[in-house]
């Protein structure tokens, strides 16, 4: 069965500068399968961000802003990167990477 | 010192158009959320829109959509409300106000630096 | 929409009194709610944020309380300054909607 680990506990950044979110995933190969990505907030409910599929598909929530995040895949390190452009105060938040194994 | 200074207010023929200007000074603009609040004569506080720092995220009262735009000039120090088809019910002083911005409590907003605002009538 | 009612909408009130005022959400927003004084012919003034968190120079007659649906603003000992309205404000997320006001007067 896979595994993910996000090895950044905690990520720091300067507003308006890019914060690049780690999800290692192992058991598995990331080729077989959907990463998603979910942030929250206190007291708020989890939201679903975006995904990206087997196939290189990627999937994005209708609500968010365009631009502000991308998602990748690299085989060769079994990670999915979640980009997030110009950080402001609305993305201080915790970030969930999930699986789905097809 | 910080401050907002709005411009642009007037009066207006019903469904006509409007364009707030909102000066900010004393602080770096462009690590704030702006937002535009409104009261009507003897009326209480309405929220209006709100902006974030690189403007990903915009917001509108439900009753605005598709008639008022927010925008900002970060290079300007500036903010913008730009309001078309105007009607009798938008007459209001329009206030700029700035988020309290990002500290130890970042999670938490609230409207900490409002300017003095701008008159806008509609009325035939 | 999540509506914001304040209660009363009016109070009369002595210097040195002790008042509260409530504000009610129509469904839970944890503790995003800040609290707004505005005097005739003046702009608001941030008094609480996060439910009850002082802002910085409010006097600390003022406090804040709650979370969810049920919040309150006290003010412990009336002082002249303070006949005046009071809004709070919700923003867990938009519309960040005010409450139609409280109006404090002397009694």
């Known amino acids: 069965a896979g595994h993910l680990e996000q090895p950044q506990i905690s990520s720091t950044k300067t507003l308006s500068k890019t914060a690049r979110l780690e999800c290692v995933v192992s058991g598995i190969t990331i080729s077989a399968t959907s990463v998603y990505w979910y942030r929250e907030r206190p007291g708020e409910v989890i939201q679903f961000l975006v995904s990206i599929s087997y196939d290189g598909t990627v999937r994005k929530e209708s609500g968010i802003p365009s631009g502000k995040f991308e998602v990748d895949r690299i085989p060769e390190t079994s990670t999915s990167t979640l980009t997030i452009h110009n950080v402001e105060k609305q993305d201080i938040a915790t970030y969930y990477c999930a699986l789905w194994e097809v | 010192e910080v401050q907002l200074l709005e411009s642009g207010g007037g009066l207006v023929k019903p469904g006509g158009s409007l364009r707030l200007s909102c000066a900010a000074s004393?602080?770096?603009?462009?690590?704030?959320?702006m937002n535009w609040v409104r009261q009507a004569p003897r009326k209480g506080l309405e929220w209006v829109s709100s902006?974030?720092?690189?403007?990903?995220?915009?917001y509108y009262a439900d009753s605005l959509k598709g008639r008022f735009t927010i925008s900002r000039d970060n290079a300007k120090n500036s903010l913008f409300l730009q309001m078309n088809s105007l009607r009798a019910e938008d007459t209001a002083v329009y206030y700029c106000?700035?988020?309290?911005?990002?500290?130890?409590?970042?999670?938490?907003?609230?409207?900490?630096?409002w300017g003095q605002g701008t008159m806008v009538t509609v009325s035939s | 929409d999540i509506v914001m009612t304040q209660s009363p909408s009016s109070l009369s009130a002595s210097v040195g009194d002790r008042v509260t005022i409530t504000c009610r959400a129509s469904q839970g927003i944890y503790n995003y709610l800040a609290w707004y004084q505005q005097k005739p012919g003046n702009v608001p003034k941030l008094l609480i944020y996060?439910?009850?968190t002082l802002q910085s120079g409010v006097p600390s007659r003022f406090s804040g309380s709650g979370s969810g649906t049920d919040f309150s603003l006290t003010i412990s000992s009336l002082q002249p300054e303070d006949f005046t309205t009071y809004y709070c404000?919700?923003?867990?997320?938009?519309?960040?909607?005010f409450g139609p006001g409280t109006k404090v007067d002397i009694k």
């Open positions: 404000q919700k923003y867990n997320r938009a519309p960040f909607t």
């Open positions: 996060a439910a009850s």
């Open positions: 004393g602080f770096s603009f462009s690590n704030y959320d």
């Open positions: 106000a700035r988020d309290r911005g990002v500290t130890t409590d970042y999670y938490y907003y609230a409207l900490d630096v």
């Open positions: 902006i974030s720092s690189s403007s990903h995220y915009i």
